[in-house]
Structures are given as C-alpha cells and as structure tokens.
C-alpha cells in the first residue's frame, strides 16, 4: 500500500476554494522529490494539473498553487473558484505520476444552494448582524408582529411586538416597526451564533389573514485564509470587523489544540509572553479595522489565528471573527541572524540586519520596540541620514556588508538600551526581524578618554587602546555624522600598556587632528572590523575651545580609565518635546511602525524571550 495519505473525499460548492493536504513520510528523498496533483482519466492515465516544479495547467492558471512543507512531510494543493467541471477523481503524489507513490482523492463540486419558494436567504458571518425584513399589508398594521424559528417540526417564538424576547436572544435582538408610510417591520439580530442558523417565519397578525414571510438564515463560520510565511520573517493579519464594533475591544488569539483561543494580543493591554518584543497591534481605523504584525516568526507560531471584537478582549460566542491558518515555512529565504546580542555598560554592539537582497536600494530602518499599550516601534535611525536626537554620536546605520545585510552600531551602552529592536525596510514587509539587546556585566574592551577638549589651531592626539584579542582585526578611527562614520587616518603607536595580562599584541592607535578648527568638534569613534563586518566601537566627544596657552594636546589614558563624563552621556538622552513625525515613505499600505520618529524616550526594560541564538557584542 502507498505511504501517501490525504482526504479520500472532498465535497464543496461552486465558487468555493479547497485546500487539500497530502501527507508523506518525511525522508530526505521524499522531502526533495517532485510533488504533483493530477486528474485521473477514464482510460487510467493521470494528467498533471500542478506540480512542485512550477508546472501549472491552463485549467488551473491563476487559481491554484502547490506548497511543500518538507519539515512536516506535507504538501498542500489550493484550488480556488471551483466549478462543477472540477468534480472528478484525482491523485496527489510524489515522483512520477505513474509510479504508485500516490493517494486517490475524490473531489465533488455541487451547485450552490438555490432559493426556496418565497424564502429570502440571509447569509451572514458569525458574530455579525442580520436584519430580517418582514412586509405586511395595511389590514395588519396595528396587529401583533412576531418572528418564529422553526425548531424541528415546531415554530418557536423568538421576539414579538408586545415585548417578548426568547432567552437565547436576550440582549442581542430588537424588533423595529418602520414609520407609517412603510408596511414593513424588521428584526435585527446582533452577535450571530452558529446556533442562530435555520428557518425563520415573520408574521403580522395572528388569524387566517396574517401576513407571513419565510427567511433562511445561514451563519457562516469564517473560512480561514491560508497564510504562508517564512521562518524568521514577518506576518501581518489585517482584521476588518466592521464599523458596528469600532468601539469594542479587539483581540488576536491563537487556537490551541482544545477549544481555547489563547489571546496573543488585545487592545486592553494583554500580550502573550511568547510574543514579547515581536508584535505590534496597530491602532484601529474609524471603521473598526486594525492589523497585527508579528516578526521573527518561529516554527511554533504556526496555527490557526482568530481576530475578533468583544468587550472582554477575548473570544466569546457571538464575537465577530476573522480566521487565518498560518503555515511557517522552514525552508526560509530569510537567513539566520542572532536574535540576542549582548553588550556591556559603556561598550557597544554591532547588529546585523537581513533584508531582501533584491531591494538593495530600499531605505533601511532600525526602531525600538516599546511594549506600552498595544506596542509601537519608534524609529531611531534610517539609511537616509536621519538619527533620533537622543542617539546622536552613538548610533549609526551602515549599508555594509551589503548584498542582503546592513549593520547597526550602537555604543555608549547603558542599562536603558536593553530591549527589543526591529530591523526593517520600506520594501518587502516580510523581512522584518527582531533582535534583543541584553546588557551584561563586564568592561568595554576598547579604552578611550571620557571626553576631550581641543584647542583651535593646535594639534590633538586621541588614544584608543585595543586589547590583544583584536590583534587580527582592522583598527580604525572615524568621525561620526548622521549618514555614517567617515574613516580618518590614524597611527599605530605600538603595544598598549592599558591592559593587565595582555601581550605585545595589544595596540594603541591614535587619532591626530592637526590645526584644529571648529569643524573638528563632534563625536569620534574608534573601532575594529574584519572586512565589511564591524565589531566593537568606542566613542569620544571632542569639544573645541579658544587657545589659552600654546602647544599641542596629548590626551592621556588617565581620563580614559575614569568614568565617561556624565554630562556628555546625559546630553544624548536629553528630554525633547514629544513629537511624532509621520514619515509618508514608511509602509504606505500599513501603519505597522506608526509612531515613526517619535522622540519620547520610553521605558526599555529587558525581557528575556529565551532565545537560542545569541551573539556577543564583539563577535560577528
């Protein structure tokens, strides 16, 4: 018998979509061999309609796809816009159509349900609102109006104009009688439940002259939209529940194997710990729609997600909902990059950010995730030369190494820098990644003076001491500005005496500024790199003042060993009037990182997400 397994029978109706999952033993050979979906002919052959090698029959053009999930040992065939012509016997299989590694599937597509005689059909989504209209004649204008539901053989009163409401509908039904001009009454049922589906009868009057109207209410459980995203990538759930729930709390939940739907995030401030640092719930629009962005997708994020609206901020019967089935593809195009980077107070980190290499011209951004309320990610720096004021002199976004990766360097670290940061671009929104910066115990490896004052017209020499662990690295000095850090000439002055237990491989590399001018004032960095990969950096602020006495200035290491000048450091965090500058270039189609360039310096408590991939501040 074949080891392939799938649904033996699939029944659907015209216009619908089906999603057929075929299961195979996930051996190495099976994972990588051709997958196919073919239709069995009367003479026994099987004509390929779609395969994993890219073939799509003209019959399926624009309405079908085949996705392989090698890690699960499954592949999924999605077919949309079904017609009765699609009814027939099919095979899903591996390898060559005629070779027997297949499973037989019967697909039956029937005509959509027709209208019953004099019955109005109402098709409404679960949790939404239906208005059943009931016409009547003038002679019944003053008589009792009622709505019954057919339960088995018996009509059961649901609501009437005398004030009766069936307990199953309490708090979510009303009967409206239109003005005298219109011979119509209507029954409005909110928060529709699946159990509300069925045959209803409107009636005006109670005698043989009463007016009756049949209604068939179909309550649809939302079909989950299938979403396929890459491991380590990002997904956005767009949730449009309608203006009637604009002021009701919204939620996104993930169904566990039971009936529970565990809240992932809601507008009441709840957020699941597993999503800390990698989720944003975007502010809702006036029409009640909102979206949720999740980055750093993990294998365990796969599953069924529901978004909905309910005052409790969680799924309840009668919540209007939308559903998605998220598949996380482990054969990801998004490269592995460290999810945790560690640095020491006063030290630095260099973060590698992946982006879609097809979009090398895109604008690159780095933002700080803030968990307050529904989460936000104010921008800190971009590749167009903008840096948030509090980060001047200590943050730089470099296009290097390029070819799908950019680098962000942050130095003068304090405990307030611990937290989650997002790498993103204005291009492919699936390529948003998250990195957590942790501040650990330890001393910075590079030693520089705390702050330096140069004298106009004189020469200034600033030392940077590199321990022997960096002997094989390229050492550099550069002057920081908004667009990066421009390399400057420096002198290797031999071994450094700043390190205990460090041999001749330690180095003292000096920056020399000849004939200092006002333009020389600013931040200078010394650092190490290997090719286009950056390691640690240290920053020095050089102030320029008028000449007091002649001579050149040589800055000793005595100052470098002292704590950095607090004033200089603090100036990097000075309070700035809270402004949110909306950047129209960023996410035209969604406000995922809506508070762009917000200059309020929010809380940055470190939260350990238990990440397995870690990177020290100095490693690549």
């Amino acid at each position: 018998k074949s080891p392939i397994f799938g649904p033996e029978e699939v029944n659907s109706v015209e216009g619908n979509s089906v999603s057929i999952t075929c299961y195979y033993p996930p051996t190495s050979v099976n994972r990588h061999t051709r997958k196919y979906w073919c239709r069995q002919g009367a003479r026994g052959g099987c004509i390929t309609l779609i395969s994993s090698e890219g073939y799509v029959s003209s019959k399926y053009a624009g309405r079908a796809n085949l996705t392989n999930f090698p890690e699960n040992g499954t592949f999924v065939v999605n077919i949309a816009q079904l017609s009765q012509d699609d009814s027939g016997r099919y095979k899903c299989g591996l390898g060559i159509n005629s070779r027997g590694l297949s499973f037989d599937v019967s697909l039956e597509v029937s005509q959509g349900p027709g209208l019953l005689n004099d019955t109005k059909v109402y098709t409404v989504d679960l949790g939404r609102t239906v208005t059943i209209n009931c016409p009547f004649k003038t002679e019944n204008a003053q008589k009792r109006k009622s709505l019954y539901k057919q339960i088995g053989l018996y009509p059961v009163l649901v609501i009437d104009s005398s004030g009766y409401v069936n307990p199953n509908y309490t708090g979510r039904i009303r009967l409206d009688i239109q003005g005298t001009g219109q011979l119509l009454f209507s029954v409005v049922i909110n928060q529709l439940r699946l159990s509300d589906a069925g045959q209803y009868l409107c009636q005006a009057g109670d005698d043989s002259n009463s007016n009756k109207k049949n209604a068939d209410l179909q309550v649809l459980k939302p079909e989950p939209e299938l979403v396929y995203e890459d491991l380590r990538g990002s997904v956005t759930f767009h949730c449009a529940l309608g203006p009637e729930v604009a002021n009701v709390a919204k939620f996104l939940c993930r169904q566990s194997s039971g009936e529970n739907c565990d809240v992932v995030v809601n507008t009441l401030g709840k957020r699941a710990p597993a999503f800390e640092g990698r989720i944003l719930l975007n502010p809702q629009d006036k029409d009640g729609s909102f979206s949720v962005v999740i980055t750093g997708l993990r294998k365990e994020d796969a599953g069924r997600y529901l978004c909905g609206a309910h005052s409790d901020g969680q799924l309840q019967e009668g919540s209007p909902i939308q559903a998605w089935q998220l598949f996380v593809n482990e054969e990801s195009t998004i490269p592995r990059s460290p999810t945790v980077v560690k640095g020491v107070a006063g030290g630095s980190v260099a973060v590698l950010c992946p982006y879609n290499r097809k979009e090398s011209k895109s604008i690159k951004y780095w933002c700080l995730w803030e968990g307050a309320q529904n989460g936000r990610c104010p921008l800190l720096v971009d590749s167009e030369g903008w840096v948030k004021a509090q980060y001047e002199g200590r943050l730089s976004l470099l296009e290097e190494p390029g070819n799908g990766t950019f680098t962000v360097i942050l130095n003068q670290l304090t405990s307030r820098d611990a937290g989650f940061y997002w790498c993103l671009t204005n291009g492919d929104t699936l390529w948003r990644t998250t990195v957590e910066i942790k501040i650990i115990e330890g001393e910075p490896n590079l030693k520089v003076p705390g702050n330096v004052t140069a004298v106009l017209g004189e020469t200034l020499k600033v030392p940077c001491h590199f321990p022997c662990k960096f002997s094989s690295y390229e050492k550099y000095w550069c002057k920081w500005n908004n667009t990066g850090c421009q390399a400057l000439p420096s002198q290797d002055e031999g071994p450094s005496k700043a390190f205990v237990n460090c041999d001749e491989n330690s180095r003292l590399v000096s920056l020399t500024l000849n004939l200092v001018t006002r333009a020389d004032e600013g931040w200078y960095w010394c650092g190490v790199k290997q090719g286009h990969f950056y390691g640690e950096t240290a920053a020095v602020y050089v102030a320029v003042e008028e000449r007091k006495a002649a001579g050149s200035r040589d800055v000793s290491l005595a100052k470098a060993d002292a704590a950095p000048d607090e004033k200089v450091l603090d100036s990097g965090f000075r309070e700035i009037e809270n402004k949110a500058i909306q950047d129209p270039r960023l996410f035209a189609e969604e406000k995922a990182v809506a508070d762009t360039r917000d200059q309020a310096d929010g809380s940055r408590a470190s939260v350990d997400s238990g990440s397995s991939e870690e990177q020290g501040g100095s490693s690549r």
Partner: nanobody
Framework: EVQLVESGGGLVQAGDSLRLSCAAS????????MGWFRQAPGKEREFVAT??????????YYADSVKGRFTISRDNAKNTVYLRMNSLKPEDTAVYYC?????????????????WGQGTLVTVSS
C-alpha cells in the same frame, strides 16, 4: 469545553451494518474537525475516520482498513457526526471513540484531538 456523546453501538453479525452518532455540545462554534477512533481489547487506540470542514467544504479521511466500508458524515445543524459501518467484520470489534479538534495538522494523530467522548462498544460476532 466541548462535550461529546457517542451512541449507536451494539452487537451485530459479521456482514451487518451499524450507524454510530456523536453529538457535540458546549463550545462547538470553533470546532472544525471531528473524527472516530477505536480501541480493540489489548490494542492501541487507532484512527478510523475524520471529517474536517471549512465553510461549505468537507474533507473526509479514512484508515486503509475501513476504506470502502465505512462512511463519515455530519449534520451541522445538529452538531452531530455519524459513522456508517457496512460489511462489518469481527476485527472491527472495539470501543469506538468520537474526538473533536479546532485544528487539523494530521487527522490520524490522537494528540491532535483535545476533546473525547466516553466511547461506545461495537461487537461483531462471526
């Protein structure tokens, strides 16, 4: 929680038919998958058949041992799933359990199903 109650089991002759019913109550509005498993004396519980649905589409899965003899169906309005068993054999003797789930990764796996009924005994004599 979803409560599941099976009925329809009993003693039949080989070759006869039976119809099992499984009525679901409680929080059924997020249930998308219901299936039948069976456990013969001294054996592991095994997959028999599953029906999964999405809107007006049904997907039916069967174990090789029952293919062509058993049919799974559902009545959405009654929140009930049925298992029609034809051409019964003595080796079909077992306690038949109904199971329900909100998600479907692999219909054959027991741990995919969070809710289980108490079971109904089917005995097929030769």
């Amino acid at each position: 929680e979803v409560q599941l109650v099976e009925s329809g089991g009993g003693l039949v002759q080989a070759g006869d038919s039976l119809r099992l019913s499984c009525a679901a109550s409680g929080r059924t509005f997020t249930t998308y998958v219901m299936g039948w498993f069976r456990q013969a004396p001294g054996k592991e519980r095994e997959f028999v058949a599953t029906i999964a649905w999405s809107g007006s589409t049904n997907y039916k899965y069967y174990a090789d041992s029952v293919k062509g003899r058993f049919t799974i169906s559902r009545d959405n309005a009654k929140n009930t799933v049925y298992l029609r068993m034809n051409s019964l054999k003595p080796e079909d003797t077992a306690v038949y359990y109904c199971a329900a789930s909100t998600v479907l990764t692999d219909p054959r796996r027991l741990n995919e199903y969070a809710n289980w009924g108490q079971g109904t005994l089917v005995t097929v004599s030769s």
